[in-house]
Every structure is written in C-alpha cells, then in structure tokens.
C-alpha cells in the first residue's frame, strides 16, 4: 500500500512538473529589463520570453508582440525553446507511461511489467527535469554573469523573470516525481506466490470430488 | 571602446554591384545586431537590412531582391552586397551596433563614419 | 512597413522651446527612438525607448509618448542644436526611420 502512494505521490508531482514547464515556456519573462526613466512615470519595463516581448509601463499598460520570426529570437533564447518543447514532449511520454504502468489502472495485467514501465517513466520524467534545468540555468548564469561585469552598462543589466523560478520549480517537480517512480522496484517474489496459489486452488478442488 | 567602420569602392558602376565592410572592434559580432542604413545627398536615413547576432538577416522590403548581409565572426566584418545599382543608389552607407541582443532592443548608440558610395559612369 | 512622419522643418529662436512630432501608421508601443544628424557627421542617438536620455546627452532633450504619437521636445534651443532629427521605431519588422525634421535657428 506504501508503494502505491508513493506512485501517486511521484506521478502527482511529475504531472505538476509538466505542467510547470508548459507555464515556464508560456510566461514572456526569461529576461527583465527595467529601464528608470527620470521620473516614475517613464519607468518601462521590457520582458522578454520564448515567444514574444512585451514592454510594461510604469501605468501598468503592457504590449506584447510575437515573435515575427526565429530571426529575432537571440541564441540562447532559441535553444532554450528548443530545449523546453523537447522536454514537454518528453514529460507527456512520461504521463502516458505513468498511467500504462499504474497500478490503479488495467493497461498491462503483469504487474512485473507495470512496476518496469513505471521505472521507465520515472527515467523519462527525470530526463524531461534535466531538460528544463539545463536552459534555465543556462539563462540565469548569463544574465548573472551580466550583472556582475563591470564591462556592461548599468541600463543594460537584466534581471531574471518568474519564468526561470518557474522551470526552477517545474525541473525539481519532475526531479522528484520522476526519482520517487524510480524507486518503485518490480515485485521479486511475483512467481513464488503464482504458483503457491494454484497449487492450493487444485488441491482443494480435488478434496471437493 | 566600441568602433564601428566602413569600407567600399567609393565609385560604382550602373548595374553594378557593391560590395561593403563594415569592420568592428570592442565587442563581438555574436552578441549584437549590426543595421546598415544609407543615406542620400541631402536626404533622409533609409533602413537597408540587420544582420543579427544569431547570424540571421533582415532585409528592407524595397530592397530586398538586390540585397545580402553576411558576416565573418572572426575578423569581426558584416558585409552588404547590393546587385544591380542604380543612379539613386549613390548615399552615404552606414553600419552602426545595436544595444543589445534581442530585436527589441533596436536602437542604436554607436555607429560608423559612413562611406560614400557613387553610382556613376 | 510601418511608416513615420514627421513634421519637415521648423524655425526657432535659442531660448525657446520646441517640439518635433513623429505619427507612426501603427502602434509602435513605446520602441521609438531618436536621432540627431548634424551636416557631414554620423547620426547621434539623443533619446531611446520614447523617454530615455542617452548618456551625454543635456537634459534640455526629452521625448515622450507611446503607441502611435510620440514627440522630441527641446527646451531651452541651443545653437548647437542646429540639425535634423530623425525618429526610428524598433516594434515592427523591418524597422524604419522618420524622413526627418530639420530644425534651423533664426
């Protein structure tokens, strides 16, 4: 019993992992630029995202734009979109083979089988984490790197935007889920018990003629 | 100390076409946009094309069938090609660095002497 | 391509106080800029972002508005400031400048 909610436990916060990362490609803010202007209501405030830009004024007034094109997305920005839709692509593979392998489900009969398909959906859920951790990291050690560089102009420093606390979170959701599905071994004494039942069940059955 | 300077033929043929450097210094070519703009005699700026950091470009609608930027990172150099040059062709050609990485950080703060380019024969 | 006009030349007095308008054809947000140009130099970026004062630029430059109108204004004119100024949004692909506004001293 321990183990099965230790399986929901672990499929609940990959499912919330993934769905993290889907809110951390979404969210416009991998980098924040504050521009102060001379007085508070020059103020702006520029986002910029895997998808699009928005700039935000000091009246609250944002607009957002697209992306006309690759174009216009810098390098890193465009391997860490790379990067984050692999690992959505990944972490859905991995709820698929979560709910294949559970054991409240009756996808696969073997539950042998069920306790490996979990293993390996703990594995994917594991690799979808390293996926969105290693562009956020990527993202937050450059514009660290920035910061400190005495070489950038102070109205050139960025700041990190929620979508890289976000992947922080998501990538430690999918970490965990993914680990504690790992950790569900395949039950060793499966045959054993097969057998002992149906030699009881025929044993009995003679008894009855 | 970021320089941006242009070079080319100066005199160019009509259906020519021209070949510019623009040679860059004090900062690298793999983290900002570089436009080249032109200009001609007693007139306004006109936008040409960018060549962004991630090595792609953009060109101006009116000229883009004529136009390519390139760029060789390591001798810090972005090109413009222009086939087929006209009589209106003849401006002062410019590069200049943009602020920043992204496509909405166009504006730009350092920018190149300028060359003179006469379409003439 | 979005187009920006401006307003072509203007008159002024040193002292005075004056105000150079440019109208984009859609909405730029707040990604205009502007530029000085002085006769045989290179353009000078005075103000980014509509409001922004580039560095070393004097504090009689300001610029303001967003979306589609935006305005430069100079107060108090120096006779330095003999030039055309020219805008130039960054929102719209491929960007564009402004046919300029020539500014004379009297």
């Known amino acids: 019993m321990a183990s099965m909610g230790l399986q929901v436990m672990g499929i609940a916060l990959a499912v919330l992992g993934w769905l993290a990362v889907m809110l951390c490609c979404a969210l416009p803010m991998w980098r924040v630029t504050a521009f102060i202007g001379s007085n508070i209501v020059t103020s702006q405030t520029i986002w910029e995202g895997l998808w699009m830009n928005c700039v935000v004024q000091s009246t609250g007034q944002m607009q957002c734009k697209v992306y006309d094109s690759l174009l216009a997305l810098p390098q890193d920005l465009q391997a860490a979109r790379a990067l984050v839709i692999i690992s959505i692509i990944v972490a859905a593979l991995g709820v698929l083979l979560s709910v294949v392998g559970g054991k409240c489900t009756n996808c696969l009969e073997d539950e042998s089988a069920k306790a490996k398909t979990m293993i390996v959906a703990g594995v994917v859920f594991l690799l979808a984490g390293l996926m969105v951790i290693v562009p956020v990291s990527w993202t937050a050690h450059n514009i660290i790197q920035d910061f400190y560089n005495p070489l950038v102009a102070s109205g050139q420093k960025r700041e990190m935007g929620a979508s890289l606390y976000v992947g922080w979170a998501a990538s430690g959701l999918l970490l965990l889920g993914g680990g504690l599905l790992c950790c569900n071994c395949p039950p060793r004494t499966d045959k054993p018990y097969s057998a002992k039942y149906s030699a009881a069940r025929s044993a009995a059955a003679s008894n009855y003629v | 100390q970021v320089q941006l300077k242009e070079s080319g033929p100066g005199l160019v043929q009509p259906s020519q076409t021209l070949s510019l450097t623009c040679t860059v210094s004090?900062?690298?070519?793999?983290?900002?946009?570089v436009i080249w703009v032109r200009q001609p005699p007693g007139k306004g700026l006109e936008w040409v094309g960018v060549?962004?950091?991630?090595?792609?470009?953009e060109y101006s609608s009116p000229l883009k069938s004529r136009l390519t930027i390139s760029r060789d990172t390591s001798k810090s150099q972005v090109f413009l090609k222009m086939n087929n040059l006209q009589t209106e062709d003849t401006a002062m050609y410019f590069c200049?660095?943009?602020?920043?990485?992204?496509?909405?950080?166009?504006?730009?703060?350092?920018w190149g002497q300028g060359t003179l380019v006469t379409v003439s024969s | 391509d979005t187009v920006l006009t401006q307003s072509p030349a203007l008159a002024v007095s040193p002292g005075e106080r004056v105000t150079i308008s440019c109208r984009a054809t859609?909405?730029?947000?707040?990604?205009m800029h502007w530029y000085q140009q002085k006769p045989g130099q290179q353009p000078k970026l005075l103000i980014y972002l509509a409001s922004h004062l580039d560095s070393g630029v004097p504090a009689r430059f300001s610029g303001s508005g967003s979306g589609t109108d935006f305005t430069l204004t100079i107060d108090p004119v120096d006779a330095d400031d003999t030039a055309t100024y020219y805008c130039q949004q960054s929102w719209n692909a491929p960007y564009t400048f402004g046919a300029g506004t020539k500014l004379e001293l009297k």
């Open positions: 004090g900062f690298s070519l793999r983290s900002y946009g």
């Open positions: 200049a660095r943009s602020w920043d990485t992204n496509h909405i950080y166009g504006w730009f703060p350092y």
């Open positions: 859609e909405s730029v947000s707040t990604l």
């Open positions: 060549m962004w950091n991630n090595g792609n470009t």
